[in-house]
Amino acid sequence: EVEKTACPSGKKAREIDESLIFYKKWELEACVDAALLATQMDRVNAIPFTYEQLDVLKHKLDELYPQGYPESVIQHLGYLFLKMSPEDIRKWNVTSLETLKALLEVNKGHEMSPQVATLIDRFVKGRGQLDKDTLDTLTAFYPGYLCSLSPEELSSVPPSSIWAVRPQDLDTCDPRQLDVLYPKARLAFQNMNGSEYFVKIQSFLGGAPTEDLKALSQQNVSMDLATFMKLRTDAVLPLTVAEVQKLLGPHVEGLKAEERHRPVRDWILRQRQDDLDTLGLGLQGGIPNGYLVLDLSMQEALS
């Protein structure tokens, strides 16, 4: 904390300008009026204050607004936002999308910090809902933010936001989230041709139903094993050996290395051993020849 000292003669700040970068911390504390700072916050970002000097300016604002900063100040924090703690941000009431964008811009290119996560939380609570504009903004800055949302929240994500998503941004999504995102991705990429479409949709296939996987198997997509292993087990089980062979193309040989893991293991148990043998991979565990397979779920539906 900067020691309280009187402002030297002639150094009282009349406005927030470049001359203040030459002030020592104690001079900033003594010579800059907090109310002046608050009304001219828009200038602070353009002035190359050191991080130590920004600490002093933050301290002045904290004293002026102990209950939390007003949005008129928050919107113009700029680099000063990097000095805020989550505890500071929890005192804010942020309702303007422009304010949110301005602060996300400061953090652009960096991982989502605790400050940003708290800011987003405050913003969503302040608005009362996760509307399309908000989600568009958040996914533009943090495509990976999608995986932090609940399936219910994801249902309001506009398909247009899907274009910004990179494969690594879905790494932390669970199957329930992909179930919601996949139909949106399918819609977003529907006008692309076969090979381009597959490149884009591939990351979302963990939410694809059986019929879509069957359709893909007719398009020579050559799905890699890593993608296949992330598919929903219930979507893979109904696929025939021929369909899986077409779906994987040259990657079909990789099934042998994965035969003990889901969904490959469960799929093998559903196939006739005769059909599995046609792959020539030595896959074992299929239904022996001569056995009849009864689909009990179908029988229950008929009775």
Epitope: I21, P48, F49, T50, Y51, E52, Q53, L54, Y79
Partner: nanobody, 115 residues
Framework: EVRLVESGGGSVQAGETLRLSCTAS????????MGWYRQAPGDECELVST???????NYADSVKGRFTISQDNAKNTVYLQMTSLKPEDTAIYSC?????????WGQGTLVTVSS
């Protein structure tokens, strides 16, 4: 990687002159605003002088008329010519890109002025 190497410090008598140099690499030097900072023992960091990419200069009140900042874009070097040195100019001097917002940090070059 941004690299700034300061040199030219030393021990002098009051009233004498020194010229500090700072050679930069790892960024577009002629697009950058540069500054010289100093920190005296037991005191806090202080900005001494700045030079912007268009060549305009600014100085702390305590060094106005005595110090001159300049730059040579061809050599990626910024200079601080210090005349009429005083004992209170004793400090470690560091140069920085103003955009870094770091101030006094790193090695720097020591200037000692005795009376």
């Amino acid at each position: 990687e941004v690299r700034l190497v300061e040199s030219g410090g030393g021990s002098v008598q009051a009233g004498e002159t020194l010229r500090l140099s700072c050679t930069a690499s790892g960024f577009t030097f002629d697009d950058s605003d540069m500054g010289w900072y100093r920190q005296a023992p037991g005191d806090e960091c202080e900005l001494v002088s700045t030079i912007s990419s268009d060549g305009s200069t600014n100085y702390a009140d305590s060094v106005k008329g005595r110090f001159t900042i300049s730059q040579d874009n061809a050599k990626n070097t910024v200079y601080l010519q210090m005349t009429s040195l005083k004992p209170e100019d004793t400090a470690i001097y560091s140069c920085r890109t103003m955009a870094s917002r770091i101030g006094c940090w790193g090695q720097g070059t020591l200037v000692t002025v005795s009376s």
